[in-house]
Interface confidence: low
């Protein structure tokens, strides 16, 4: 089964994926790939974490949550119709065949011609002063210039609160449907 998530062209898409570290900082490698989860690893890897860091990513793919607490949800910036499809979040738990695999279906809708003043569901637009990521062409530059004087703990707390409310809203608004 796969869970379906929706975003509009030009928005940031959010694909949730979580695990509970055995102990704080005791991280498990995670990979995100485009395409359904294969038997091992991730196909077409777009982002990867290891036991310590986010150590690989490609343009427009970010972890905005606190991956050190097990929030490895993927944000895809400024989506296009080509971003539609299945994404694999693979939590690489040590041991034979222990991996947790999640297939998430991303459906991209064309942007509305007249944007309505609806509730903002995009993390970075909802809190532009908290954490803003911007792509700047091939250099894949990220700017955190609008970050106020708050520490990582505050960021993760805000992110967790936002994530929890967003997940609830997404389910309530039928943004996610279990297949």
């Amino acid at each position: 089964s796969e869970v379906e998530y929706r975003a509009e062209v030009g928005q940031n898409a959010y694909l949730p994926c979580f695990y509970t570290p055995a102990a704080p900082g005791n991280l498990v490698p995670v990979c995100w790939g485009k395409g359904a989860c294969p038997v091992f690893e991730c196909g077409n890897v777009v982002l990867r974490t290891d036991e310590r860091d986010v150590n690989y990513w490609t343009s427009r793919y970010w972890l905005n949550g606190d991956f050190r607490k097990g929030d490895v949800s993927l944000t895809i910036e400024n989506v296009t119709l080509a971003d539609s499809g299945i994404y694999c979040c693979r939590i690489q738990i040590p041991g034979i065949m222990n991996d947790e695999k999640f297939n998430l279906k991303l459906v991209i809708k064309p942007a509305k011609v007249t944007p309505a003043p609806t509730r903002q569901r995009d993390f970075t637009a909802a809190f532009p002063r908290m954490l803003t990521t911007r792509g700047h062409g091939p250099a894949e530059t990220q700017t955190l210039g609008s970050l106020p004087d708050i520490n990582l703990t505050q960021i993760s707390t805000l992110a967790n609160e936002l994530r929890d409310s967003r997940l609830a809203n997404d389910l309530r608004d039928s943004g996610a449907t279990i297949r």
Epitope: E41, C42, D50, D53, V54, Q142, L144, G145
Partner: antibody
Framework: QVQLVQSGAEVKKPGSSVKVSCKAS????????IYWVRQAPGQGLEWMGS????????NYAQKFQGRVTITADESTSTAYMELSSLRSEDTAVYYC???????WGQGTLVTVSS | QAVVTQEPSLTVSPGGTVTLTCASS?????????PNWFQQRPGQAPRALIY???NRHSWTPARFSGSLLGGKAALTLSGVQPEDEADYYC?????????FGGGTKLTVLG
């Protein structure tokens, strides 16, 4: 567009240490991994280690473990690579790179000679 | 630590096609190793060409393509130009560490 500007060439004695800096200009690099790569004269590229400035944690290649320290100062958008117990075979151009290895500094030549 | 092996040197005629490969001492290279390819001309810093096996950067000419071939990562240059003469390096990811291949010196005849 972000550019990485490295410190100038250094000449060091065997057994000493060197600290090379890598400053990001035109943007911040806080959430990007900064990689350090070296290249000895006429030789290939060698990955030394990396750091994500906003987290402050570094990864090191096994070969350099215990001899290299990679740090970052977010306030100045600068990453540093310090290599200790230098020997002649550490003579190389040292590069910093960022944004999935798409942005590279100009390189810093470190010469180790008695 | 893993060893990544490339052909030390290859020669190609202008307009021809050449394939550079990248093998891992740990076994077959898969997309999980997120193969990257770089070009380096004398006196210059490396320039990224391909990421995650087969994805070209926006500045990478279409004549460069990446793939997996017989358990190795591969970089194919089609319609080789004189300016493609350079050193080429692959880079593989091994759970927490990156390892470069030894590099391939590509010579374009003429």
């Amino acid at each position: 567009q972000v550019q990485l500007v490295q410190s100038g060439a250094e000449v060091k004695k065997p057994g000493s240490s060197v600290k090379v800096s890598c400053k990001a200009s035109g943007g911040t690099f806080s959430s990007y991994t900064i990689y350090w790569v070296r290249q000895a004269p006429g030789q290939g590229l060698e990955w030394m280690g990396s750091i994500i400035p906003i987290l402050g944690t570094a990864n090191y290649a096994q070969k350099f473990q215990g001899r290299v320290t990679i740090t970052a100062d977010e306030s100045t958008s600068t990453a540093y690579m310090e290599l200790s117990s230098l020997r002649s075979e550490d003579t190389a151009v040292y590069y910093c790179a960022s944004a999935s290895h798409t942005i590279w500094g100009q390189g810093t030549l470190v010469t180790v000679s008695s | 630590q893993a060893v990544v092996t490339q052909e030390p040197s290859l020669t190609v005629s202008p307009g021809g096609t050449v394939t550079l490969t990248c093998a891992s001492s740990t076994g077959a290279v898969t997309s999980g190793y997120t193969p990257n390819w770089f070009q380096q001309r004398p006196g210059q810093a490396p320039r990224a060409l391909i990421y995650t096996t087969s994805n070209r950067h926006s500045w990478t000419p279409a004549r460069f393509s990446g793939s997996l071939l017989g358990g190795k990562a591969a970089l194919t240059l089609s319609g080789v130009q004189p300016e493609d003469e350079a050193d080429y390096y692959c880079l593989l990811y091994y759970g927490g560490a990156w390892v470069f291949g030894g590099g391939t010196k590509l010579t374009v005849l003429g």
